[in-house]
Interface confidence: low
């Protein structure tokens, strides 16, 4: 709204950089063949690139990534009782970001 | 724990708390009647609740919010030349979070 500019501070651009995000650990990352289990923890923190660049043709992208294996609990229900196993999920952390030109494919004429 | 799955460390739950997120300032927040302008900055940081709670019937929600007006530039194109105006956008920051029971409406029978 254009109205009162009284207490409004200048908006500061959210620069292109890594920020902490929440990653949901979906069950099919662990076992695609079986739905009869739970995963603990259900979500973890990851580092991801986000923010804006100076113009629309440029996007904030990861310039350096690192794969990080973490151990989760796979809680299977066997004969109505929980059975606990360990599983590894590989998370992707972004270590560095850059504003990268987005190449939009030209329409074929 | 550590050795059992090579270098995999135990996954740590992303707790329900405020984290910095990027909010895209869409043009219709400023002027729904006109599309012939740009906004600067195109995005800003906000504080938002995210993370997981202990079970599926509970969700991470904001328990305290604060509205924060910020001043943006509305760059109109008038006769092919940029004209700079100021506008206010009100952002919502989450100040505190809690794990809140999700009441799923019962199907009407």
């Amino acid at each position: 709204s254009l109205g009162s500019l009284a207490a409004a501070e200048p908006a500061v651009i959210a620069e292109c950089k890594t920020r902490t995000e929440v990653f949901q650990i979906s069950r099919n990352l662990i076992d695609r063949t079986n739905a009869n289990f739970l995963v603990w923890p259900p979500c973890v923190e990851v580092q991801r690139c986000s923010g804006c660049c100076n113009n629309r043709n440029v996007q904030c992208r990861a310039s350096q990534v690192q794969m990080r294996p973490v151990q989760v609990r796979k809680i299977e229900i066997v004969r109505k009782k929980p059975v606990f196993k360990k599983a590894t999920v590989t998370l992707e952390d972004h270590l560095a970001c850059k504003c990268e030109t987005v190449v939009t494919p030209r329409p074929v004429t | 724990s550590l050795g059992s799955l090579a270098a995999a460390e135990p996954a740590v739950i992303a707790e329900c708390k405020t984290r910095t997120e990027v909010f895209q300032i869409s043009r219709n927040l400023i002027d729904r009647t006109n599309a012939n302008f740009l906004v600067w900055p195109p995005c800003v940081e906000v504080q938002r609740c995210s993370g997981c709670c202990n079970n599926r019937n509970v969700q991470c929600r904001a328990s305290q919010v604060q509205m924060r007006p910020v001043q943006v530039r509305k760059i109109e194109i008038v006769r092919k030349k940029p004209v700079f105006k100021k506008a206010t956008v009100t952002l919502e920051d989450h100040l505190a979070c809690k794990c809140e029971t999700v009441v799923t409406p019962r199907p009407v029978t």
Epitope: V83, F84 | S1, L2, G3, S4, E9, P10, A11
Partner: antibody
Framework: EVQLVESGGGLVQPGGSLRLSCAAS????????MTWVRQAPGKGLEWVAS????????HYPDSVKDRFTVSRDNAKNSLYLQLNSLRAEDTAVYYC?????????????WGQGTLVTVSS | DIQMTQSPSSLSASVGDRVTITCRAS??????LNWYQQKPGKAPKLLIY???SLQSGVPSRFSGSGSGTDFTLTISSLQPEDFATYYC?????????FGGGTKVEIK
């Protein structure tokens, strides 16, 4: 390489106090629950205390509750056990161990132990 | 509290023998059961976690089985370096408890 090194053991009189330390290296200490386990001479293993990764949660068996306090300093990669009101039956080798992502895990890294002798 | 009872408390065996140690929990602990090996003057070493999962670096002659209240540690062919004391431990609930140990001696 993961290493846990205990220190601070020694001879102490009944009713006395002692502070044990465990220096950790080779892993992200702040991500792990840590545990103290003790072993009296010629006896089996006994769980003594556990502390969460951030240090906010602690667990003890009744045998040491209100006498022993586990703490940690993640900035120093160190685990501690404060032993108060010591009794002869507290004489044991005290081991620190890494407990994984929660208390309900296995202990797959152990220190070499430090001997506490309670005697007059 | 959950009591862990190991049997036998000691056994004598020869190199090449198949050795079985049992551990019984006073109530169901699902598969929250770990096995450790300890040699004199040394810290315990994790062999098996979650009842049947072999810890990395542990020889495949060691295996674990069981669920609920009854668990078994088996050494398929005893080697000279396996003479030690073995402990089971439940991590199902606090207080965390260990079995009394089984000493495996040379016959």
């Amino acid at each position: 390489e993961v290493q846990l090194v205990e220190s601070g053991g020694g001879l102490v009189q009944p009713g006395g106090s002692l502070r044990l330390s465990c220096a950790a290296s080779g892993f992200t200490f702040s991500s792990f629950w840590m545990t103290w386990v003790r072993q009296a001479p010629g006896k089996g293993l006994e769980w003594v205390a556990s502390i969460s990764a951030g240090g906010g949660i602690t667990h003890y068996p009744d045998s040491v509750k209100d006498r022993f306090t586990v703490s940690r300093d993640n900035a120093k990669n160190s685990l501690y056990l404060q032993l108060n009101s010591l009794r002869a039956e507290d004489t044991a080798v005290y081991y620190c161990a890494e407990s994984g992502g929660d208390i309900y895990s296995d202990f797959d890294y152990w220190g070499q132990g430090t001997l506490v002798t309670v005697s007059s | 509290d959950i009591q862990m009872t190991q049997s036998p408390s000691s056994l004598s065996a020869s190199v090449g023998d198949r050795v079985t140690i049992t551990c019984r929990a006073s109530q169901s602990i699902s598969n929250y059961l770990n096995w450790y090996q300890q040699k004199p003057g040394k810290a315990p070493k994790l062999l098996i976690y979650a009842a049947s999962s072999l810890q990395s670096g542990v020889p495949s002659r060691f295996s674990g089985s069981g669920s609920g209240t009854d668990f078994t540690l088996t050494i398929s062919s005893l080697q000279p370096e396996d003479f030690a004391t073995y402990y089971c431990q439940q991590s199902y609930s606090t207080p965390l408890t260990f079995g009394g140990g089984t000493k495996v001696e040379i016959k």
